[in-house]
């Protein structure tokens, strides 16, 4: 017995023989195939998407999702009320702001309604899954003849976010980057007035309010300085 299973990242996995033979004797029936993993992200604490790879199922299956919060006033089992679909098959669930409790253990259960004993239950720390919106309203101020200050806004509690600023001139092959704490401002002490600078910023829900690994999208870039660098050999490649 060696059943091939398509895993959530699209790779074939031939661990089914182990799955079916190595569990302790009070396990579920041997016909039980593993369900896809659920991955959840909380977008700016406005809504949360919990998704799974529906194509990993041997045949198209409308899997169902239930959720609750462990040891809290919200520990009643809830049915997903807003499914996401991929090719008319359930592939996720969207939860709204009022259903998100960041600092309680979130329990999510995926189930095959045709075979109810086929279910998988995961636990998640939502505070580690927050992805903020990209920083907005980037502005540049000249503090002195050679010093620039970059400021930006976030549509979230500022003290919860850390930031990464990247900048480069039209002469640079790569970005220079600098980590910035919750203060959401960055100073560049030495600016060359003959060069054109580009800045961009992204943010992360870390480390004061959570331990998220995922960054926001990059902000729209903001530019400073000379628009004409005729002798710049990299200009056209960078702007292509």
């Amino acid at each position: 017995l060696n059943t091939t299973i398509l895993t959530p990242n699209g790779n074939e996995d031939t661990t089914a023989d182990f799955f079916l033979t190595t569990m302790p004797t009070d396990s579920l029936s041997v016909s039980t195939l593993p369900l896809p993993e659920v991955q959840c992200f909380v977008f700016n604490v406005e809504y949360m998407n919990c998704t799974w790879n529906s194509s990993s199922e041997p045949q198209p299956t409308n899997l169902t999702l239930h959720y609750w919060y462990k040891n809290s006033d919200n520990d009643k089992v809830q049915k997903c009320s807003h499914y996401l679909f991929s090719e008319e098959i359930t592939s996720g669930c969207q939860l709204q702001k009022k259903e998100i409790h960041l600092y309680q253990t979130f329990v999510v259960q995926l189930q095959d309604p045709r075979e109810p004993r086929r279910q998988a239950t995961q636990m998640l720390k939502l505070q580690n899954l927050v992805i903020p919106w990209a920083p907005e309203n980037l502005t540049l101020h000249k503090l002195s003849e050679s010093q620039l200050e970059l400021n930006w806004n976030n549509r979230f509690l500022n003290h919860c976010l850390e930031h990464l600023v990247q900048y480069r001139t039209d002469w640079d092959h790569s970005w220079t980057e600098q980590s910035v704490d919750y203060r959401h401002k960055f100073s560049l002490p030495s600016v060359d007035g003959q060069k054109r600078y580009t800045f961009r910023v992204r943010s992360r829900f870390n480390p004061l309010c959570g331990s998220a690994q995922h960054w926001s999208e990059w902000s729209h870039p903001i530019h400073w300085g000379s628009n004409t660098s005729k002798e710049n050999p990299f200009l056209f490649a960078l702007e292509a």
Partner: nanobody, 126 residues
């Protein structure tokens, strides 16, 4: 072939400590969700501690604050430090592993685990 081997069980008095170890051979545990489960006579198997490979760890209510899960990827080993043991902790303790794609996946459902050890007996006398 993947093998999980638990050790560290035994007979102890209430209030004592034990440290269970689970060593894997045949594949790395660095990208596996891990779980410690237990089965007491006449009871359902239950999770004790579960962990994603990203480091998020969860405990069953009755062991929270007494038991600690840890892993050493270099040694391909996970541990369960059990302090302030109680008679109701008496059970066979199993280590389980599930290769996962996402760093945040931690399973409390036993049927989600692909690999299991044979178990180690923990007996706590009053």
């Amino acid at each position: 072939e993947v093998q999980l081997v638990e050790s560290g069980g035994g007979l102890v008095q209430a209030g004592d400590s034990l440290r269970l170890s689970c060593v894997a051979s045949g594949r790395t545990l660095s990208r596996c969700a891990m779980g410690w489960f237990r089965k007491a006579p006449g009871k359902e198997r239950e999770y004790v501690a579960i962990s994603s490979w990203g480091g998020d760890t969860f405990y069953e209510d009755s062991v929270e604050g007494r038991f600690t899960f840890s892993r050493d990827n270099a040694k391909n080993t996970v541990y369960l430090q059990m302090n302030s043991l109680r008679p109701e902790d008496t059970a066979v303790y199993y280590c389980a592993a599930a290769p996962t794609s996402f760093a945040t996946t931690a399973y409390s459902s036993s049927n989600s685990y692909a690999y299991w050890g044979q178990g180690t007996q923990v007996t706590v006398s009053s």
